[in-house]
Interface confidence: low
């Protein structure tokens, strides 16, 4: 199983070596987005519908004081970035903790000079990995330094920094609604002409968690090949929920050969193609 | 203190609406999801209703949706609940209730409405 | 919704003796667990959270365990006060959902 992980996402922006005020930050609980943070009012405020119904408003005043924090953090290393041109520049910081089935944790952080890595930490140990480019070397060295003037960077600091984050990853996965129910998925097969004498049939799966789904076309109850098939990728719909979709090419007047067949945590079902309108099939919810 | 206040219960006729008021104190209401439970004569509890701390989400129990609306004044400290179209079976102790998302560790005393005719 | 069925429905004991209550839930619900004790004409008040975790102030004879679809309340040794109506409940999904209560009676 996977593990459950809480991740943020930091970037402070510079324009001709002015470092902007404020920040960018965004959240992610289980790989969904939870979080993100409004520059304009300057708080962290909940992004989905099951981020906003399930948790209370003091994460939020817990998560707005730790992003001003981080974001602050993050906007005094880019200062000691040194190799700073004109233009616009930005500095990333992705933080991540893990919670696996065995109950152990992971903890890291990776740092992203206009989008190119340079740094990665692990908190629970404090090893630093720097890529093999001397970009990214020059780069690391600078904020490592840095680093070591700041009193606060201690080793004591990044396992807080671990702890911390493991403790809301913990206390959110508690929180009321449980984030791992399952909902099954809204199914629809919709058909559009290609050309004279085929047409693609479409059958999207939408709103559905966790996240594993099968979806795939059947002729006469046999599954097609991978390659006359085309899939599209497993997506959050930002509502704590996924979206996906299968499509394939069919000759006219067969439709009622194909069906799209949907697996999704030990239910399953299969969807006929419409003749002449878009057909909508919702399974039972169980939420 | 922490406490809740529950008013507004009364004996109605059914087919008829009633308000009932919840007053909060002594804690940050405006941080807090704030639901409705109820228990009828010598029965078990019933969960009715939840706002959101800022009152952009509500749900209802089945029971109720449609008929019952939930809400709130943060500027008051109050918890509201309009409940029209009352039925017999909707006679209860009606409770406001909150605390953390996971145990409702404050309650009010309770409020009770009988739907008679 | 998710139905919490808890038994018994009632039980006889005595001061001193260990009581256990169980709550089965219609499908998973992780550990979004709570567990209430009411006496008549009285509040309910708040037990445990979580499934498993104290209330402050409660005292330590009160536990709960479980997780998924089977939870237990245990008190380890009766005292006089505990006598009361338990109720189990259900926060996993919305609507949130109690079970019918578990009337403990002096033997």
């Known amino acids: 199983a996977e593990p459950h992980s809480l991740r943020y996402n930091l970037m402070v922006l510079s324009q001709d070596e002015s470092v902007q005020s404020g920040f960018l930050a965004e959240g992610h609980l289980d790989g969904q987005p939870f979080l993100r943070y409004d520059r304009q009012k300057r708080r962290a405020k909940p992004q989905g519908q099951w981020a906003e119904d399930v948790l209370g408003a003091k994460t939020w005043d817990t998560e707005t004081e730790d992003l001003t924090e981080n974001g602050q953090d993050l906007r005094r290393t880019l200062t000691h970035i040194k190799d700073q041109k004109g233009g616009l520049h930005s500095l990333q910081e992705i933080r991540v903790c893990e919670i696996h089935e065995d109950s152990s944790t992971r903890g890291s952080r990776h740092f992203y000079y206009d989008g190119e890595l340079f740094l990665s930490q692990n908190l629970e140990t404090q090893e630093s990995t720097v890529p093999q480019s001397s970009r990214a070397q020059t780069l690391a060295m600078n904020v490592t330094n840095f680093w070591k003037e700041d009193a606060m960077k201690t080793k004591t600091h990044y396992r807080a920094m671990q702890a911390d984050c493991l403790q809301k990853l913990q206390r959110y996965l508690k929180s009321g609604v449980a984030i791992r129910r399952t909902v099954p998925p809204m199914v629809n097969v919709t058909c559009s002409e290609v050309s004279e004498g085929n047409i693609t049939v479409t059958c999207r799966a939408s709103s559905f968690y966790p996240r594993n789904i099968t979806l795939t076309w059947r002729q006469d109850g046999v599954s097609l090949s991978h390659n006359t098939q085309q899939w599209g990728d497993v997506l959050p719909d930002g509502n704590g929920t996924y979206q996906t979709w299968v499509a394939t090419r069919i000759r006219q007047g067969e439709e009622q050969r194909f069906t799209c067949y949907m697996e999704h945590s030990g239910n399953h079902g299969t969807h006929p193609v419409p003749s002449g309108k878009v057909l909508v099939l919702q399974s039972q919810r169980t939420d | 203190q922490v406490q809740l206040v529950e008013s507004g219960g009364d004996v109605v006729q059914p087919g008829r609406s009633l308000r009932l008021s919840c007053a909060a104190s002594?804690?940050?209401?405006?941080?807090?999801?704030i639901h409705w439970v109820r228990q009828a004569p010598g029965k078990g509890l019933e969960w009715v209703a939840v706002?959101?701390?800022?009152?952009?989400?509500?749900y209802y129990a089945d029971s109720v949706k449609g008929r019952f609306i939930i809400s709130r004044d943060n500027s008051k400290n109050t918890l509201y609940l309009q409940m029209n179209s009352l039925r017999a079976e909707d006679t209860a102790v009606y409770y406001c209730?909150?605390?953390?998302?996971?145990?409702?560790?404050?309650w009010g005393q309770g409020t009770m409405v009988t739907v008679s005719s | 919704a998710i139905q919490l069925t808890q038994s018994p429905s009632s039980l006889s004991a005595s001061v001193g003796d260990r009581v256990t209550i169980t709550c089965r839930a219609s499908?998973?619900?992780?550990?979004?667990l709570a567990w209430y004790q009411q006496k008549p004409g009285k509040v309910p008040k708040s037990l445990i959270y979580?499934?498993?975790s104290l209330e402050s102030g409660v005292p330590s004879r009160f536990s709960g365990s479980g997780s998924g679809t089977d939870f237990t309340l245990t008190i380890s040794s009766l005292q006089p006060e505990d006598f009361a109506t338990y109720y189990c409940?259900?926060?996993?999904?919305?609507?949130?959902?109690f079970g019918q209560g578990t009337r403990l009676e002096i033997k």
């Open positions: 499908q998973g619900i992780s550990s979004a």
């Open positions: 979580d499934a498993s």
């Open positions: 002594g804690f940050t209401f405006s941080n807090y999801n």
């Open positions: 209730a909150s605390g953390p998302p996971d145990a409702f560790n404050i």
């Open positions: 706002i959101r701390y800022d009152g952009i989400n509500k």
């Open positions: 409940q259900q926060f996993n999904s919305y609507p949130i959902t």
